[in-house]
Amino acid sequence: EETEIVMPTPKPELWAETNFPLAPWKNLTLWCRSPSGSTKEFVLLKDGTGWIATRPASEQVRAAFPLGALTQSHTGSYHCHSWEEMAVSEPSEALELVGTDILPKPVISASPTIRGQELQLRCKGWLAGMGFALYKEGEQEPVQQLGAVGREAFFTIQRMEDKDEGNYSCRTHTEKRPFKWSEPSEPLELVIKEMYPKPFFKTWASPVVTPGARVTFNCSTPHQHMSFILYKDGSEIASSDRSWASPGASAAHFLIISVGIGDGGNYSCRYYDFSIWSEPSDPVELVVTEFYPKPTLLAQPGPVVFPGKSVILRCQGTFQGMRFALLQEGAHVPLQFRSVSGNSADFLLHTVGAEDSGNYSCIYYETTMSNRGSYLSMPLMIWVTDTFPKPWLFAEPSSVVPMGQNVTLWCRGPVHGVGYILHKEGEATSMQLWGSTSNDGAFPITNISGTSMGRYSCCYHPDWTSSIKIQPSNTLELLVTGLLPKPSLLAQPGPMVAPGENMTLQCQGELPDSTFVLLKEGAQEPLEQQRPSGYRADFWMPAVRGEDSGIYSCVYYLDSTPFAASNHSDSLEIWVTDKPPKPSLSAWPSTMFKLGKDITLQCRGPLPGVEFVLEHDGEEAPQQFSEDGDFVINNVEGKGIGNYSCSYRLQAYPDIWSEPSDPLELVGAAGPVAQECTVG
């Protein structure tokens, strides 16, 4: 069975104060203080379920609960909680009031009882300025006594031996004689026993985390009914108290909801059962990243490794004397750690197998300040294989290149930092390029000519080993255009089509035995190639969608000279839409009427084969339709002044009108515009 422990607010401290040091029971005030430094209020409870009072926290994050003079009704066990909006602390230690004229009963506790080691017994007395005495059962006099030392005292047994076993209790007394004594604490039995074996301790996710991440530590043991304690850098920070744990708990989950930069460090846990403790768990190093700049990770001799061989991963950091960690994607914990005096660390992957393939990254962190870490390095892909993966060859901006232009052939694959070979069909020699971070697989061809066209492929060319087989990439056909007369391109039924409709793009050439190539602006590869028997290729586009909109062109080449292609056809813009785009409306020579002069309004749309209509102040203008989009406006009696807009419809789709253009205002010139001027 497991016990879910959400990192609770640390338990508050409960103590008593009095203004009668010789007879504290005459006026006692209980105080509760939160160690967390922030809480809204405190609740004082008696005997577990009696609600005594609730008090707001002062600036010192504490609250007073005045009890006054003790009466029989005050007898009982008190504890307090801090209480916030969505967080309730664990209970404080219980303060026991046992009578009307007697000091509160102290509480005795001890560190683990380990043979030969020093043991500390803690006696908590609740009131300041009290003396303390430690008793061992069977002995009349106190074993040890301590004067006024605050609210608690620590008794030490230097070296725990069999003779020190037994029942111990402690008492407190008033500072001045005649002493007034407390009841003895409940007895504590000290038994030297073997320690329980260390618990199993891990984090659910990786212990290398970014700020704000959620981290759960899991501490577990096969032993039943245990309480657990979580330590950070050797100090206790949280516990699953038995009183808060389900019976039979064999595990505790300690949750940090949102990790801060100061939460890094060495975490460990222990469990205990009454006086028997476990060995501490193996530590988990929690590293909080993104404090220092990222390191660089490189593979030597390279990132592709033959099975059974070894590879060194070098993590190059920025600062001296850091601790480095190597991480593999998918691995729960860092694979290796290295503490170095310099600013880089070498990690050896020895006799690698297929399971070692994957993305690796590294970090560095300081071990003195909460394990503050760097950003993660860029991932490095390590391939354990006897055969390189196939690279991919493509051209940028396109594999169809006008004569005299520039093009870059890219050989790209999942393996980086490797050399490449570019091979052209029919040529004996190949171009060779060593990979780097800046020009990973780029083969630029400037001022392209007919000699560059043809079929290309590429492959990896590692310089560090010959035992790994290589595979060629896909074949890329590089076409050079501008060597034949251009074809024409038109759309059937027209350049605008509704989504889901079919259309055909017809590329018409002038020469027989031609292969036609359809191109789209922005695409690196031709969309389609056709070798018709005649002079025209019909590129069928069924059920077009919005993404088929764009600017198309076509070229062709002859069977006798493949890859030596024609000039591009004129571009053809295709619109896949239910609503044609709006036209633009402009005025010539200007938007201001001059005496006796007309104005021509020019409506221009992006599609051919359309009919335009003009609107004046929301109504159809007198000269309603125009096929070329030109409308002549005069200003007889000032009727031409006002707002104009225009729309168009396709002749193929006469029921579909475009959006109207943006409005355009025509104005009259200052002065008597329409007034005649007579002489004599």
Partner: antibody, heavy 120, light 107 residues
Framework: QMQLVQSGAEVKRPGSSVKVSCKAS????????FYWVRQAPGHGLEWMGG????????NYAQKFQGRVTITADESTNTAYMEVTNLRSEDTAVYYC?????????????WGQGTTVTVSS | DIQMTQSPSSVSASVGDRVTITCRAS??????LAWYQQKPGRAPKLLIS???SLHPGVPSRFSGSGSGTDFTLTISSLQPEDFATYYC?????????FGQGTKLEIK
């Protein structure tokens, strides 16, 4: 905003018991205190006791100690008040109320009241 | 137990009047005092908490003052809906206790 809905009116015989429920909706009862207040016909308000559900901790006015039990069920967001050994002077409207904020700053949300009539 | 005493037990006033109700505690309650308004057949409604803090949604014509043992509730300009019974309550120590109430009637 939290709402408190109380159980319906009850008619009881002297010597019997009654258990009134108060269901909170709209927000968790996790960090609130709940109180019970009664009002006899033509009289003022009388504080009976309270509970903090998260602790299961209660406090009762001395007058009701031993005869009144206040409980809460966190899983259903419901508080209960049981009065045993009913007498005719227990005839009253019983209200449950929520303390505002964590600490007590006043009872800011009240139930509609449950009328309990004790009659032979 | 801390006794809370309100005065007057009842008061008659007209719309627009300024009305003051006082509440005295038998021992100091700091500022842990609340004021409530109750209309016939309805549950009480919180007006003021912590002696002087106006509860959200309560009209600004209501105000509270005082600390220790003496407290006042003031209505600066009576409105027709203000005619009701008003109670003070201490929250300094258990048991929390109410005043006997002040009935505000139309003159």
């Amino acid at each position: 905003q939290m709402q408190l809905v109380q159980s319906g009116a009850e008619v009881k015989r002297p010597g019997s018991s009654v258990k009134v429920s108060c269901k909170a909706s709209g927000r968790s009862t996790y960090n609130y205190a709940f109180y019970w207040v009664r009002q006899a016909p033509g009289h003022g308000l009388e504080w009976m006791g309270g509970i903090i559900p998260i602790f299961g901790a209660t406090n009762y006015a001395q007058k009701f100690q031993g005869r009144v039990t206040i409980t809460a069920d966190e899983s259903t967001n419901t508080a209960y008040m049981e009065v045993t050994n009913l007498r005719s002077e227990d005839t009253a409207v019983y209200y449950c109320a929520k303390g505002s904020g964590n600490y007590y700053y006043g009872m800011d949300v009240w139930g509609q009241g449950t009328t309990v009539t004790v009659s032979s | 137990d801390i006794q809370m005493t309100q005065s007057p037990s009842s008061v008659s006033a007209s719309v627009g009047d300024r009305v003051t109700i006082t509440c005295r505690a038998s021992q100091s309650v700091g500022t842990w005092l609340a004021w409530y308004q109750q209309k016939p057949g309805r549950a009480p409604k919180l007006l003021i908490s912590a002696a002087s803090s106006l509860h959200p949604g309560v009209p600004s014509r209501f105000s509270g003052s005082g600390s220790g043992t003496d407290f006042t509730l003031t209505i600066s300009s009576l409105q027709p809906e203000d005619f009701a019974t008003y109670y003070c309550q201490q929250a300094d120590s258990f048991p929390y206790t109410f005043g006997q109430g002040t009935k505000l009637e139309i003159k």
